[in-house]
Interface confidence: medium
């Protein structure tokens, strides 16, 4: 009804003598803002109809005081009972210690103003601690994760309990193998109160039938326990035996497969056999109860491998361990592997003999071009530095205690090397003359792989007519030595070949050896004919003066040079190829003025009144720089020019005239020349 209280707590609370009970409790009064005034806890209560009051043993009684209307009721302890609630909504209680005779109904009487409520709370207190419960799944399978739950409908703060797990009396902890986790939890709510431990693990098939125990402990003392037995379902467990495990070809082998255990049991024993993971078919089998026999009569090498057997129950197929059957046989036909191939000359090469054999081959014979190589009996043949000599076909024979194999396949060792013995050959007629065309051929002795290209040095020295042939169109006198390279994947260069081009002497010139300065008449003069190069080196020298041959020899000598020796001189050098003329070299002899002569124009007899020009003619080198004129009395006429002009002439001008000439070398004087001035007809007429 509207004035009903709502009170929530667990239906029944469980405990045992000496423990405690905590009663989680929540309430709501009919009036929203009402507060508890009084709380009573009865034991074995009854309602007195006469007094209309509840009677019984009071375990707890608390009332709000008038002095402090707001004072709280909680955390007050009376005897064994502690009120852990409040005046609004919490009515939690704790009884410690609890007695077996506390079993039955408690009455919780609550008053809030005019509103009252009596709430029955049922306690089940046993004399001894009760057993925990164990929950487990209906089916447990090997290696599959399973969770077991151990629980107890009890929890009370101040009386701690511990749940421990045991497998066959050995404690299980979180570090036990195959255990995933152990988790404990305590629940204390208005719905229920319990303590639980969950054990998650992966059972092995060998755990089948083993006991699992959950133990309740308080202060290291065992209070109670419960034991269950594990029913682990697992696939059949099979045991395989091979006799013998090592057998020679053509002998027989028996394999047995026994079913040692299965849960659930096998309906029928149907054993399957597998080799290297594949089912075996068409084999002779003998099936017995819990056992199967596989008989291999005449073993071949293909029968070697890993064998196992399989049988199934409702859980699934169970497999035995794998057992290896070794079949011994003589080596199989061999083949050779070469690393690297092709090989580079000078490289390290390894040849490996591949031949299946059981037991492994112990001895190997190596062959090069079908000839045995003594001394090396290993599976690997190593050539530290391979040379073209090592090229060829290699094979090997493997041997074990059962015999030796055959040669299946030879391997070819190809040794690559750069072209060998490369030479540059001149194909033209010799000697080669300047301006000739020259053909050069690049030759080599051997190459692997074949030569694919050629190179020439210096580059661009000619045109390539075809691979390995170079044409130099017009060879110069100073042609560089030419070298060629023949190339496959590597290039080999020939030594440079000198073309030895023949040419006429070059850069011929005249050198003045002495004197060091200008040449003056009477001095000793020595000229030398010089040139830069000549091939062939044997030469002859010739001298020409003004185009005419003068003499042969390297030097041209003048004991006392005279002005008549002046002129253009050429030096000429020749060898067997040709001759080369130097540029003209002008010999200039310096001398003082000589052969001075006075010439009179228009003549040496001139009429008075006319004009006469006297010229001082001479031979001088360098030319005369200063002239001096004298009359018959030796008087200096103070005229410094080459010409002396007399105008107008007078009879007194008659007489002899001389001139003197001076240059940087010296002075020369002319003999006198006579000028006769005669009277004009006018003058004669006057007289």
């Amino acid at each position: 009804s509207a004035n009903d209280w709502t009170v929530d707590h667990p239906q029944t609370l469980f405990a045992w003598e000496g423990a405690c009970i905590r009663i989680p409790c929540k309430y709501k009064t009919p009036l929203p803002k009402a507060r508890l005034d009084n709380i009573l806890l009865f034991q074995n209560y009854e309602f007195d109809k006469a007094t209309k009051k509840f009677t019984g043993t009071v375990l707890y009684n608390a009332t709000k005081t008038e002095k402090d209307p707001e004072s709280e009721l909680y955390l007050s302890k009376q005897g064994r009972v502690t009120f852990l609630g409040n005046r609004i909504d919490n009515c939690t209680l704790k009884i410690h210690p609890i007695r077996a005779n506390d079993s039955g109904n408690l009455g919780l009487r609550m008053t809030a103003g005019t509103e009252r409520w009596m709430e029955p709370i049922h306690l089940n207190v046993s004399e001894k601690p009760f057993q925990p419960y164990i929950q487990m799944p209906s089916e447990i399978r090997e290696s599959q994760s399973v969770t077991l739950t151990c629980g107890l409908n009890f929890s009370c703060f101040g009386y701690d309990i511990l749940l421990k797990w045991f497998l066959e009396d050995s404690e299980i902890t979180s570090i036990t193998s195959s255990v995933t986790s152990i988790t404990s939890s305590v629940t204390s709510s208005i719905k229920n109160v319990y303590t639980e431990s969950k054990l998650t693990f992966q059972p092995k098939w060998t755990d089948h039938g083993k006991s699992v125990k959950c133990q309740v402990q308080h202060s290291s003392k065992v209070l109670s326990e419960r034991t269950v037995r594990l029913d682990v379902k697992y696939t059949p467990k099979l045991e395989i035996k091979v006799n013998p495990t090592e057998v020679e070809k053509n002998n027989s082998v028996t394999m047995t497969c026994r079913v040692n255990s299965s849960n659930p049991k096998l309906r029928t024993v149907a054993v399957s056999w597998f080799k290297d993971g594949r089912p075996l078919e068409d084999q002779e089998l003998e099936q017995e109860q819990q056992m199967s026999k596989l008989i291999l009569h005449s073993v071949t090498k293909d029968m070697r491998g890993k064998y196992r057997c399989q049988a199934s129950n409702d859980i699934g197929p169970g497999e035995s361990e794998e057992v290896e059957l070794t079949v011994h046989y003589a080596p199989e036909p061999s083949r050779v592997h070469i690393y690297p191939s092709p090989a580079e000359e000078g490289q390290s090469v390894e040849l490996i003999c591949e031949s299946l054999a059981s037991p492994s081959a112990t001895n190997y014979t190596w062959y090069h071009n079908r000839k045995p190589i003594p001394g090396d009996t290993q599976e690997k043949l190593r050539i530290p530095k391979v040379s073209p000599w090592h090229a060829g076909n290699y094979s090997c024979l493997a041997e074990n205690r059962l015999g030796h194999g055959k040669i299946d396949q030879e391997a070819k060792l190809d040794v690559h090397y750069a072209p060998k013995a490369v030479t540059t050959v001149i194909q033209s007629f010799t000697p080669i003359l300047e301006g000739d065309s020259v053909t050069l051929v690049c030759r080599y002795n051997s190459s692997n792989p074949d030569v694919t290209s050629y190179r020439w040095n210096p580059q661009g020295s000619g045109s390539v007519l075809k691979p390995g042939v170079l044409r130099i169109q017009k060879v110069t006198w100073d042609s560089m030595p030419v070298s060629c390279a023949a190339c496959n994947h590597k290039c080999s260069w020939a030594l440079p070949v000198i073309l030895n081009v023949h040419y006429a002497p070059r850069d011929v010139k005249v050198l003045k050896v002495s004197p060091a300065s200008e040449i003056r008449a009477g001095q000793r003069v020595l000229l030398q004919c010089d040139f830069a190069e000549s091939n062939p080196a044997e030469v002859r020298f010739f001298w020409k003066k003004n185009g005419s041959l003068v003499q042969e020899g390297r030097y041209l000598s003048f004991g006392s040079v005279s002005p008549e020796d002046s002129g253009n001189y050429n030096c000429m050098v020749n060898n067997s190829i040709g001759e080369t003329l130097s540029q003209a070299w002008n010999l200039q002899v310096l001398y003082a003025p000589r052969r001075l002569r006075v010439s009179i124009s228009p003549g040496d007899h001139v009429m008075e009144g006319k004009k006469a020009t006297l010229s001082c003619e001479s031979d001088a080198n360098p030319p005369i720089s200063q002239y001096t004129w004298f009359d018959s009395s030796g008087q200096d006429l103070h005229s410094s020019g080459q010409k002396l002009r007399l105008e107008p002439l007078e009879v007194q001008h008659t007489g002899s005239y001389r001139c003197k000439g001076t240059n940087g070398i010296g002075t020369g004087e002319s003999p006198p020349s006579t000028l006769t001035v005669y009277y004009s007809p006018e003058t004669i007429g006057k007289r």
Partner: nanobody
């Protein structure tokens, strides 16, 4: 080009000794085999003795073991075959050969010389 020139052959009485020389030139490989084989008229070629240049290891045909010794002089590029206790069946043309391997039948992929005649009289 490899050139091998043999010398030292001749006529000798049974039980006598001879020393054959082989002057080698033009071998460019660091690791090669050099040795002797012989050929008697109408018979197959037979390897006599061989040695490797790299380590000096030697090989002998069973018929000459203990009687013949192969040696070399690196400075002179010469290989020698000292033949003691000669027998009439040792009569043959002895060739010097060079190649990559020592073989029972001689030297593989050979370059060989003209040979020198050895005659053992009884």
């Amino acid at each position: 080009q490899v050139q091998l020139v043999e010398s030292g052959g001749g006529l000798v009485q049974a039980g006598g000794s001879l020393r054959l020389s082989c002057a080698a030139s033009g071998i460019t490989s660091d690791d090669y085999a050099i040795g002797w084989f012989r050929q008697a008229p109408g018979k197959e070629r037979e390897g006599v003795s061989c040695m490797y240049s790299s380590d000096g290891s030697t090989y002998y045909a069973d018929s000459v073991k203990g009687r013949f010794t192969i040696s070399r002089d690196n400075a002179k590029n010469t290989v020698y075959l000292q033949m003691n206790s000669l027998r009439p069946e040792d009569t043959a043309v002895y060739h010097c050969a060079a190649g990559p391997w020592c073989f029972v039948t001689g030297v593989g992929r050979e370059e060989w010389g003209q040979g020198t005649q050895v005659t053992v009289s009884s």
